[in-house]
Amino acid sequence: FPMFKRGRCLCIGPGVKAVKVADIEKASIMYPSNNCDKIEVIITLKENKGQRCLNPKSKQARLIIKKVERKNF
C-alpha cells in the first residue's frame, strides 16, 4: 500500500468542518499514537456512503469527542 511521506495518519488534511447529523452512522476517534501524532475523528456515513474525516478542531468534533469520552469513562 503506497505510503504518505509524513506519518501514518488515517486522514488527509484537516478534514471537513461538519457532517449532517442525520447522515452519521458511527463516529470513531483515533487518539495520538506512534503512527499519528494527532487526534482523528472518522465518521462512517449511512447508506454505504463511505467515511469522512472530521476536523478535530471543529465544534462538531469536540462535541463528539466529549460524548464518546463520557460514554467510555
Epitope: 504518505f4 509524513r6 488515517l10 488527509i12 488534511g13 484537516p14 468542518k17 463511505g50 467515511q51 469522512r52
Partner: nanobody, 126 residues
Framework: EVQLVESGGGLVQAGGSLRLSCAAS????????IGWFRQAPGKEREGVSL????????YYADSVKGRFTISSDNAKNTVYLQMNSLKPEDTAVYYC???????????????????WGQGTQVTVSS
C-alpha cells in the same frame, strides 16, 4: 462558485514530458486535497496522484511512481503534475479534482471527490 481548470495537455512523443496545471478557485484551498485522475477511452477513471494542500503530503498510483511528480503553489491555488518518461499507455483525458475529509485508504477513489475540472487531453504517440 467552485472552479477547477486544467491546462497543459497536448501531443507528445513517448519518452517526452508534459506539465499539467490545475487552477482552483471558489473554496478554501488549504482545506482540500487535490487529486489528478485520468480516463482513457473505454476505460474506468483511475487515480494518478494526490497532494494535500495543508501539509504537502503526496500519494502516487504505482503505474506512475518515479515518473510523475505532483506539487502545489498555495499562493496561486494551483496544483501541478509533472509527467516525465511518458508512455503511450498514459494517453487519456486528465482531470483534477478536490476532495475534503478524505481517508488515506480512499485517497485515489474518484467517488470520494467533491469537485471536478473539465479535463485536458494528453496523447502520447509511439
Amino acid at each position: 462558485e467552485v472552479q477547477l481548470v486544467e491546462s497543459g495537455g497536448g501531443l507528445v512523443q513517448a519518452g517526452g514530458s508534459l506539465r499539467l496545471s490545475c487552477a482552483a478557485s471558489g473554496f478554501s484551498f488549504d482545506d482540500y486535497a487535490i487529486g489528478w485522475f485520468r480516463q482513457a477511452p473505454g476505460k474506468e477513471r483511475e487515480g494518478v496522484s494526490l497532494i494535500s494542500s495543508s501539509d504537502g503530503s503526496t500519494y502516487y498510483a504505482d503505474s506512475v511512481k518515479g515518473r510523475f511528480t505532483i506539487s502545489s503553489d498555495n499562493a496561486k491555488n494551483t496544483v501541478y503534475l509533472q509527467m516525465n518518461s511518458l508512455k503511450p499507455e498514459d494517453t487519456a483525458v486528465y482531470y483534477c479534482a478536490a476532495g475534503q475529509g478524505l481517508l488515506r485508504a480512499q485517497a485515489l477513489r474518484w467517488e470520494s471527490y467533491d469537485y471536478w475540472g473539465q479535463g485536458t487531453q494528453v496523447t502520447v504517440s509511439s
